[in-house]
């Protein structure tokens, strides 16, 4: 029976150029976590597995950063960034877990945001 | 350029004891995932061993067919990496190939035969 | 016996398109990413495709790699007889702490 639960920044917003940590958090369970998945949309963003460490896509390498912990740093946004993230969770033996984060990269300096995941 | 040279096979009784060295060029072995894998004569690859990157976990990984005999290392100074066989048997004769990576295995070195025999 | 199933051989006509299937369970190919690795003959193996469909650079396009459910698959469009060789597909196992080969299959051009 999975019983954890996924804690996320939920709906954030940033400047463009600026930076953001995407972070989740799997509570209330004592599965395993063997890897979690970045994904933007159907895109792979990164891989984090507890064996073989980071991956980061290619395509991504410029602006993706890992970290902290399982979170994920995104770099000189742009608007294009602007849409769904999900972090998801593999576990054993519970299975897997998603969470979703919205981000909003803003043109103006009037972004508002979640400060504890904000980057200056 | 990205090399891997593999040195230190050769004919060995069972029983007996070998330490193979790989020579690491162009990156550095303790920031990366390392591996052995190893090929018998006419069969497909089977992994040995894998080491992780140092600023990762530092963790060493085996095949149970070699758990307890086997001993993957790495000197840093030397940019080499290690693996030392003991107890070895005749079922351990194989090219012996190590590997850097860790999301698949992206550079290989040329192999070194392993023979067990008496 | 390994827990990942290929057929043993393979052939195909230069400039034909051929695939390879890698066939498992959903403890292992369903819920893990596949790598491929070609080894040319009496040289080795090298990196073909990464998490499931990803190529490194320097891998032409005709090779493409695939996943759906418990089952992968490579597949070689245009076949060369440089193609020739012997493919591996490959998972890490997070559970036995280690990589699981293929029995690999021999792929013959005609």
């Known amino acids: 029976m999975m019983t954890g639960t996924i804690e996320t920044t939920g709906n954030i917003s940033a400047e463009k150029g600026g930076s953001i940590i995407l972070q989740c958090h799997l509570s209330s369970t004592t599965a395993q976590v063997t890897q979690v998945n970045w994904e933007q949309q159907d895109q792979l963003l990164a891989i984090c597995n507890a064996d073989l460490g980071w991956h980061i896509s290619p395509s991504f390498k410029d602006r993706v950063a890992p970290g902290p912990g399982l979170g994920l740093t995104l770099q000189s946004l742009t608007v294009n960034d602007t849409g769904e993230y999900f972090c998801i969770y593999h576990t054993y033996p519970d299975g897997t877990y998603t969470g979703r984060i919205f981000l909003e990269v803003l043109e103006s300096s009037v972004a508002e945001h979640g400060a504890r995941f904000q980057i200056p | 350029e990205v090399q891997l040279l593999e040195s230190g096979g050769g004919l060995v009784q069972p029983g007996g004891s070998l330490r193979l060295s790989c020579a690491a060029s162009g990156f550095t072995v303790s920031s990366n995932w390392m591996s052995w894998v190893r090929q018998a004569p006419g069969k497909g690859l089977e992994w040995v061993s894998t080491?992780?990157?140092?600023?990762?976990?530092?963790?060493?990984y085996y095949a149970d067919s070699v758990k307890g005999r086997f001993t993957i290392s790495r000197d840093n100074s030397k940019n080499t990496l290690y693996l030392q066989m003991n107890s070895l048997r005749a079922e351990d004769t194989a090219v012996y190939y190590c590997a850097k990576g860790s999301y698949g295995m992206d550079v290989w070195g040329q192999g070194t035969t392993v023979t067990v025999s008496s | 016996q390994s827990v990942l199933t290929q057929p043993p051989s393979a052939s195909g006509t230069p400039g034909q398109r051929v695939t390879i299937s890698c066939s498992g369970s959903n403890s292992n190919i369903g819920a893990k990413y596949l790598y491929w690795y070609q080894q040319l003959p009496g040289t080795a193996p090298k990196l073909l495709i990464y998490l499931n469909d990803q190529r490194p650079s320097g891998v032409p396009d005709r090779f493409s790699g695939s996943k759906s459910g418990t089952s992968a698959s490579l597949a070689i469009s245009g076949l060369q007889s440089e193609d020739e060789a012997d493919y591996y597909c490959a998972f890490w196992d997070d559970h036995l702490k280690g990589w699981v080969f293929g029995g690999g299959t021999k792929l013959t051009v005609l």
């Open positions: 080491t992780s990157s140092s600023s990762w976990n530092n963790y060493t």
